[in-house]
Amino acid sequence: AVNGTSQFTCFYNSRANISCVWSQDGALQDTSCQVHAWPDRRRWNQTCELLPVSQASWACNLILGAPDSQKLTTVDIVTLRVLCREGVRWRVMAIQDFKPFENLRLMAPISLQVVHVETHRCNISWEISQASHYFERHLEFEARTLSPGHTWEEAPLLTLKQKQEWICLETLTPDTQYEFQVRVKPLQGEFTTWSPWSQPLAFRTKPAALGKDT
């Protein structure tokens, strides 16, 4: 038996992907392990190979189908197992009954673009990726802007409590370089968490007009 504490955490992206991380203190580094997904009411099952992401944790993505296909519903329960090879046999290292729509983490928003920029403000839009039509408009967003001389961690969070795929940033400094990120979360799901942050969008405010009071 492998000693130490084990943690097996998975999230559904609401369409056709379940991402899992398995961490095990004292796990054997050279052991081949995989995640196996077995839905309770579907004809298919799926497997992915766990690959190391750190000393004692492994990750993999269960690709259930085409990226925008609705492969699971709110009624599905998926048995997820971590299986590791022991000689000629596979041993179950972790198991969970997974309710996909209680454990959501959407893909990071994409296609960030500057719609309009001025000296003190900037209008930015984005799109959500591979999000289920189930959510209708019941999504929320968090955004943050990186100012010169600060870190992302210091950036104040702006919360959008509805499905609004744009923001108008105000009180910016003229002729200044900024970066912007956004993330998304559905209201649904007891263990749902924020998506990863989007790729940063760099933009520069316009310089103040010469000889004018701005």
Epitope: T74, V75, H133, E136
Partner: antibody
Framework: EVQLVQSGAEVKKPGATVKISCKVS????????MHWVQQAPGKGLEWMGW????????EYAPGFQDRVTITADTSTDTAYMELSSLRSEDTAVYYC??????????WGQGTTVTVSS | EIVMTQSPATLSVSPGERATLSCRAS??????LHWYQQKPGQAPRLLII???QSISGIPARFSGSRSGTEFTLTISSLQSEDFAVYFC?????????FGQGTKLEIK
């Protein structure tokens, strides 16, 4: 403006089948879930099931799954609910509704079905 | 199947006063609880989702809260148009089920 317009009242004999339509407008029917709910005088609101218009997948409540069929015609933006082997306790108002799987955001006006010999 | 129990069955309150309606689930349902209002001869209307999130267009006097498996709908200052039947509905386990309703009537 979101609208769900249901077909008119029906009177049926026990053992017969009823089919109710729900014509929608004001939203994209092709990526919607369409639900059906029964409201019978003594039984309150009961969720019968839904259809995902995106892929045609259906989900039926156990109490109805032997007798109910939900369909969707994406060419006319219309959902249908067919209930067979009618009995007197099926006398009720039937609602179509639009929503995610978890709650019902918009409702039709209701269709009264009376089952009587 | 999860049983939703609403209390009281009928609640008599004067206009301008506060109304508190209760809904209890027979098992843990997290925050998967939604509230509807139904007036005579009309379809239900969605008010609150996930226990406490107000729906766009619903007046601010409607609010929801949760304590374990007990959920509360509060109407802070009753208007004449608020007298109706209120239903709760769980979406934790299929089949999703409704409470039997609380009739809010004018005192």
């Amino acid at each position: 403006e979101v609208q769900l317009v249901q077909s008119g009242a029906e009177v049926k004999k026990p053992g017969a089948t009823v089919k109710i339509s729900c014509k929608v407008s004001g939203f994209n029917f092709k990526d919607s879930l369409m639900h059906w709910v029964q409201q019978a005088p003594g039984k309150g609101l009961e969720w019968m099931g839904w259809i995902d218009s995106e892929n045609g997948e259906t989900e039926y409540a156990p109490g109805f799954q032997d007798r109910v069929t939900i369909t969707a015609d994406t060419s006319t933006d219309t959902a249908y609910m067919e209930l067979s082997s009618l009995r007197s306790e099926d006398t009720a108002v039937y609602y179509c509704a639009r929503g995610g799987p978890w709650f019902l955001s918009y409702w039709g006006q209701g269709t009264t079905v009376t089952v009587s010999s | 199947e999860i049983v939703m129990t609403q209390s009281p069955a009928t609640l008599s309150v004067s206009p301008g006063e506060r109304a508190t309606l209760s809904c209890r689930a027979s098992q843990i349902i997290s925050n998967n609880l939604h509230w509807y209002q139904q007036k005579p001869g009309q379809a239900p209307r969605l008010l609150i989702i996930y226990g406490l999130q107000s729906i766009s267009g619903i007046p601010a006097r409607f609010s929801g809260s949760r304590s374990g498996t007990e959920f509360t709908l509060t109407i802070s200052s009753l208007q004449s148009e608020d007298f109706a039947v209120y239903f709760c509905q769980q979406s934790n386990n299929w089949p999703y089920t409704f409470g039997q309703g609380t009739k809010l009537e004018i005192k």
